[in-house]
Interface confidence: medium
């Protein structure tokens, strides 16, 4: 009995559902009463899910697996694995027995995109050319381990004195911290690129260091020049700082965070105490750091709707303010590719190739390429639709006349995260069916 599974590993994002495809060819007159189907871990032989004696025996895998029962009679023995975890990674074997028996193993490769790196500088005050500084690039909750590259403003690699460490967090996802020690020039840009080798997604962070400006009479309020990028569902820190004078006490401080455009109150600290969040209880100050001049605001469980500009007002005797932009982002899933028609294809046929990628933000840029990487511009229709959380599902359709054979690649780019998700389909010259049987 021939059992067919994908040759390549099935890549699944942490928290999503994965389908481990497995199929067999039922003979005429086949009934499910004849079928024994067993899914097990390839290495330890432990049972994951089974169908025997004409019925689904259920999940032995923490109730996170399911069969496609309505498709079993047609030879679809695929397994659905729900809410994928890092610990699920590995090989699963699909055993099918009717009269004869056959088996095949499919690999599950778990992945999670890395967040846009946050950059910190130490020391970060009164810097002069010739000073040695430590620049830290931190990117969170990715899987598997990242590759980290440093570059200068011209894109040339910075290799000297870099220490990179990676640690699994409470869910087995990796937080990566890369530290670059460098002697400052007159000014300079230092970029860090965190690459997920499985998703082929790159996350970029950069910091530009210029000489300090001299202080003015008013309270100088400092915020990041670049937008703060936050992944949907994570917490974001809107950084804001001021320089307290000697003898400063919190009783003198009035701190107000508000939406820049509508002036609506988000959070305040007045009369020596935290007045709390006016923003659905999702904001907090760093109260233990306020006296040192840290007026930053923590925004929890970021949503698409939070995107925009926030103003930090600081008043002691004088007053100052500055606005910081929050840019919300979510990575796009690896594109799925479909082909229509998908049977008996011949050179000269016109086909429609659809590339679909899900739950990203903001809107994606979609590029089509041939097997040589040359752009395919003609007859492409791309649509993007916001789902119930405001995240975008993108569908790009390419109409093309088949050559003798060819590869058609779709690249879905998140312009904020600078993360690229790739999908491709190869169509050979012989009459064929897609996906291959």
């Amino acid at each position: 009995l021939e059992v067919q599974v994908p040759e390549d590993p099935v890549v699944a994002l942490v928290g999503t559902d994965a389908t481990l495809r497995c199929s067999f060819s039922p003979e005429p007159g086949f009934s499910l009463a004849q079928l024994n189907l067993i899914w097990q871990l390839t290495d330890t032989k432990q049972l994951v899910h089974s169908f025997t004696e004409g019925r689904d025996q259920g999940s032995a895998y923490a109730n996170r697996t399911a069969l496609f029962l309505d498709l079993l009679a047609q030879g679809n023995a695929s397994l659905r694995l729900q809410r994928v975890r890092v610990a699920d990674e590995g090989s699963f074997t699909c055993f099918v027995s009717i009269r004869d028996f056959g088996s095949a193993a499919v690999s599950l490769q778990v992945a999670a995109p890395y967040s846009k790196p946050s950059m910190t500088l130490e020391p970060n005050k009164d810097l002069r050319p010739g000073d040695t500084v430590t620049i830290t690039c931190s990117s969170y909750r990715g899987y598997p381990e990242a590759e980290v590259f440093w570059q200068d403003g011209q894109g040339a690699p910075l290799t000297g004195n870099v220490t990179t460490s990676q640690m699994a967090n409470e869910q087995g996802l990796f937080d990566v911290h890369s530290v670059l020690r460098v002697v400052l020039g007159a000014n300079g840009t230092y970029s860090c690129l965190v690459r997920n080798p499985v998703l082929q997604q790159d996350a970029h962070g950069s910091i530009t260091i210029t000489p300090q400006r001299s202080p003015t009479g008013a309270v100088e309020v400092q915020v990041p020049e670049d937008p703060v990028v936050a992944l949907v569902g994570t917490d974001a820190t809107l950084r804001c700082s001021f320089s307290p004078e000697p003898g400063f006490s919190l009783a003198q401080l009035n701190l107000i965070w508000q939406l820049t455009d509508t002036k609506q109150l988000v959070h305040s600290f007045t009369e020596g105490r935290d007045q709390g969040s006016a923003y659905a209880n999702r904001t907090a100050l760093f109260l233990d750091l306020l006296a040192q001049g840290n007026a930053s605001l923590r925004l929890q469980r970021v949503r698409v709707a939070d995107e925009g500009s926030f103003t930090c007002f600081v008043s002691i005797r004088d007053f100052g303010s500055a606005a910081v932009s929050l840019q919300v982002a979510a990575p796009y899933s690896k594109p799925s590719m479909t082909l229509e028609p998908n049977k008996d294809l011949r050179p000269g046929d016109t086909v429609t190739i659809t590339c679909s990628s899900y739950r990203g933000y903001p809107e994606a840029e979609v590029f089509w390429q041939d097997g040589q990487g040359a752009p395919l511009t003609g007859n492409v229709t791309t649509s993007q639709m916001a789902n119930e959380q405001g995240l975008f599902d993108v569908h790009s359709v390419l109409r093309v006349v088949l050559g003798a054979n060819g590869t058609y690649s779709c690249l879905v780019r998140n312009p904020v995260l600078q993360q690229d998700a790739h999908g491709s389909v190869t169509i050979t010259g012989q009459p064929m069916t897609f996906p291959p049987e």
Epitope: Q46, V48, Y61, A62, R85, V86, A87, N169, E170
Partner: antibody, heavy 120, light 107 residues
Framework: QGQMQQSGAELVKPGASVRLSCKTS????????ISWLKQKPGQSLEWIAW????????SYNQKFTGKAQLTVDTSSSTAYMQFSSLTTEDSAIYYC?????????????WGAGTTVTVSS | DIVMTQSHKFMSTSVGDRVSITCKAS??????VAWYQQKPGQSPKLLIY???YRYTGVPDHFTVSGSGTDFTFTISSVQAEDLAVYYC?????????FGGGTKLEIK
């Protein structure tokens, strides 16, 4: 970062059994594999077995099959190892340690170890 | 089972010296080797895994080279706090196995 707190030292007689515990905190118990390892004084480490709390799967080093039995209590995020038919050869420090998956058998967080002494 | 062999049980060194510890696998383990440090009365600490990934907080004077069957763990400038036993471990296939350990001592 996560902690693993192991039960106290045990003095047991030959032929008896012992149950060691490893209480975890600071990470999602069902997202990691827990392994147990043995170290005799002045010697190297031996991997005994792992357990994956999610579905309760286990995998044993053949050398310890029938000797060790791993279980978990997910409600308290605690892993247990029952060690049976003890002989003086079983006197050692036993560590629990976590790892990310069955394909990633390196141990990033360790318990402090439980000393088991088998003596009549 | 895959046997991991650390040829030196003891290595004498001085503070500031460069020292290399070797580990040989009885069969190809690709890059699936981890290195641990263990001080007296403590549990082992993960330093490096998958041949080249540095665990968080591990100083950068620890480096590793090699793949396949031959691996080298190097301390570029030995500090007093580096005196300990170092173990290599293959995480290529179960049963996962450790080398016999190399104890770093001061001359």
């Amino acid at each position: 970062q996560g902690q693993m707190q192991q039960s106290g030292a045990e003095l047991v007689k030959p032929g008896a059994s012992v149950r060691l515990s490893c209480k975890t905190s600071g990470f999602t118990f069902s997202s990691f594999y827990i392994s147990w390892l043995k170290q005799k004084p002045g010697q190297s480490l031996e991997w005994i077995a792992w357990i994956y709390a999610g579905p309760g799967y286990t995998s044993y080093n053949q050398k310890f099959t029938g000797k060790a039995q791993l279980t978990v209590d997910t409600s308290s995020s605690t892993a247990y190892m029952q060690f049976s038919s003890l002989t003086t050869e079983d006197s050692a420090i036993y560590y629990c340690a976590r790892h990310v998956g069955r394909q990633r058998g390196y141990f990033d967080v360790w318990g402090a170890g439980t000393t088991v002494t088998v003596s009549s | 089972d895959i046997v991991m062999t650390q040829s030196h049980k003891f290595m004498s060194t001085s503070v500031g010296d460069r020292v290399s510890i070797t580990c040989k696998a009885s069969q190809d383990v690709s890059t699936a080797v981890a290195w641990y440090q263990q001080k007296p009365g403590q549990s082992p600490k993960l330093l490096i895994y998958s041949a080249s990934y540095r665990y968080t907080g591990v100083p950068d004077h620890f480096t590793v080279s090699g793949s396949g069957t031959d691996f080298t763990f190097t301390i570029s400038s030995v500090q007093a706090e580096d005196l300990a036993v170092y173990y290599c471990q293959q995480h290529y296939s179960t049963p996962w196995t450790f080398g016999g350990g190399t104890k770093l001592e001061i001359k």
